[in-house]
């Protein structure tokens, strides 16, 4: 996809993206709300693949850690917040059952607003 | 996860999320920029699973289709933009080779800014 910075654009919230291995993650939350162990490797025909996840979260070192960029501060309070999505992963639950489950991973950093009161 | 709406918060950009099947997607762009066919089913031990993707994009019917919510319009132009991420999927390339590849899917709707010139 095209890059906003290339077009002289700025993001309202600064984010950071990285490839995360199952070894880094270790556990995750599945769709039933339970904690599952993320297996390091997935069997495929002719071998195994390391489980990787492309994760995006709000940049804790970024300019926008105190609030979102470009907001009308007279009317709004703002906060950059990491949002999540579901991806399928090979996991093991608390009963040691291995299987493909949808787990939550961080996928974005978005800006949320609350209206300023008592003005 | 905690919910923004519950805390009286608004998103700077309105988004819509849904489960998308491989049959709906048909094709996708992989990490090398090539177009691949997304296979409908994934073989698992003793059976098959339908390939599903959890996708989030900017809501074309939302309030923010004309620009982001809460922006300081004196200084900034704004636009809600769908961003993408990578997830692993079972795919077939143009040479009919089947394999697990990272493909791009829509995962978020974020606000991008451009500074207003000539003020």
């Amino acid at each position: 996809h095209s890059d906003p910075a290339r077009r002289g654009e700025l993001s309202v919230c600064d984010s950071i993206s990285e490839w995360v291995t199952a070894a880094d993650k270790k556990t995750a939350v599945d769709m039933s709300g339970g904690t599952v162990t993320v297996l390091e490797k997935v069997p495929v025909s002719k071998g195994q693949l390391k489980q990787y996840f492309y994760e995006t979260k709000c940049n804790p070192m970024g300019y926008t850690k105190e609030g979102c960029r470009g907001i009308d501060k007279r009317h709004w309070n703002s906060q950059c917040r990491t949002t999540q999505s579901y991806v399928r992963a090979l996991t093991m639950d608390s009963k040691k059952r291995i299987g493909w489950r949808f787990i939550r991973i961080d996928t974005s950093c978005v800006c949320t607003l609350t209206i300023k009161r008592g003005r | 996860h905690s919910d923004p709406a519950r805390r009286g918060e608004l998103s700077v950009c309105d988004s819509i999320s849904e489960w998308v099947t491989a049959a709906d997607k048909k094709t996708a762009v992989d990490m090398s920029g090539g177009t691949v066919t997304v296979l409908e089913k994934v073989p698992v031990s003793k059976g098959q699973l339908k390939q599903y993707f959890y996708e989030t994009k900017c809501n074309p019917m939302g309030y923010t289709k004309e620009g982001c919510r809460g922006i300081d319009k004196r200084h900034w132009n704004s636009q809600c933009r769908t961003t993408q991420s990578y997830v692993r999927a079972l795919t077939m390339d143009s040479k009919k080779r089947i394999g697990w590849r990272f493909i791009r899917i829509d995962t978020s709707c974020v606000c991008t800014l451009t500074i207003k010139r000539g003020r």
Epitope: Y86, K95, F102 | R6, S17
Partner: antibody, heavy 115, light 108 residues
Framework: DVQLVESGGGVVRPGESLRLSCAAS????????MTWVRQPPGKGLELVSH???????YYADSVKGRATISRDNSIDTFYLQMNSLRAEDTAVYYC?????????WGLGTLVTVSS | EIVLTQSPGTLSVSPGERVILSCRAS??????LAWYQQKPGQAPRLLIY???TRATGIPARFSGSGSGTDFTLTINRLEPEDFAVYYC??????????FGGGTKVEIK
């Protein structure tokens, strides 16, 4: 106590629209997936649509393109907007709590599509 | 898509008897299977999840077993209030979640 209360059912003509609501209480609504399941008269259960805790919708093939599921976590309510209704949509519509299996159900609301 | 087949369609039994209901999946669903009870004019009620775990408040006479493709719901010493329709549901291949066609347990 967990409670789910459906509303919005009634008699409609083919081609018309209807919005079903499910008001939840007694639990942290925003942390749960919610589901609409329907049951035609004298028949079995059919999953119609599902919305996960993060807000994404799933639709059965029988309603895809005609239905929209949504939730408003600020008032602990979720909805099913059904358009272009058909005679085969006639059923009791139940809302239920859960992403994978359903531990609490509403009493149901009857939707009748008839000319 | 996974298909769940319940058998028999109807079962005529007397109170106090032991009842065994069957649910067969068209492919492996691990133990990701639930059972529901539905009485006439009422909503379904969750009995069993994860193939064998009883839901909150469900009497011990209800038990579930099985994994893979073959599952059973057993009701020991049938009580008068147990006459109902019983449905199984898989949640391994999600989405879509599939229900079985149901088994009606009626008074002999």
């Amino acid at each position: 106590d967990v409670q789910l209360v459906e509303s919005g059912g009634g008699v409609v003509r083919p081609g018309e629209s209807l919005r079903l609501s499910c008001a939840a209480s007694g639990f942290d609504f925003s942390s749960y997936g919610m589901t609409w399941v329907r049951q035609p008269p004298g028949k079995g259960l059919e999953l119609v649509s599902h919305i996960v805790d993060l807000g994404g919708g799933y639709y059965a093939d029988s309603v895809k393109g005609r239905a929209t599921i949504s939730r408003d976590n600020s008032i602990d309510t979720f909805y099913l907007q059904m358009n272009s209704l058909r005679a085969e949509d006639t059923a009791v519509y139940y809302c239920a709590r859960g992403n994978t299996f359903f531990d609490y159900w509403g009493l149901g609301t009857l939707v009748t599509v008839s000319s | 898509e996974i298909v769940l087949t319940q058998s028999p369609g109807t079962l005529s039994v007397s109170p106090g008897e032991r009842v065994i209901l069957s649910c067969r999946a068209s492919q492996n669903v691990r133990s990701d299977l639930a059972w529901y009870q539905q009485k006439p004019g009422q909503a379904p009620r969750l009995l069993i999840y994860d193939s064998s775990t009883r839901a909150t408040g469900i009497p011990a006479r209800f038990s579930g077993s099985g994994s893979g493709t073959d599952f059973t719901l057993t009701i020991n010493r049938l009580e008068p209030e147990d006459f109902a329709v019983y449905y199984c549901q898989q949640y391994y291949d999600w989405p879509p979640l599939a229900f079985g066609g149901g088994t009606k347990v009626e008074i002999k």
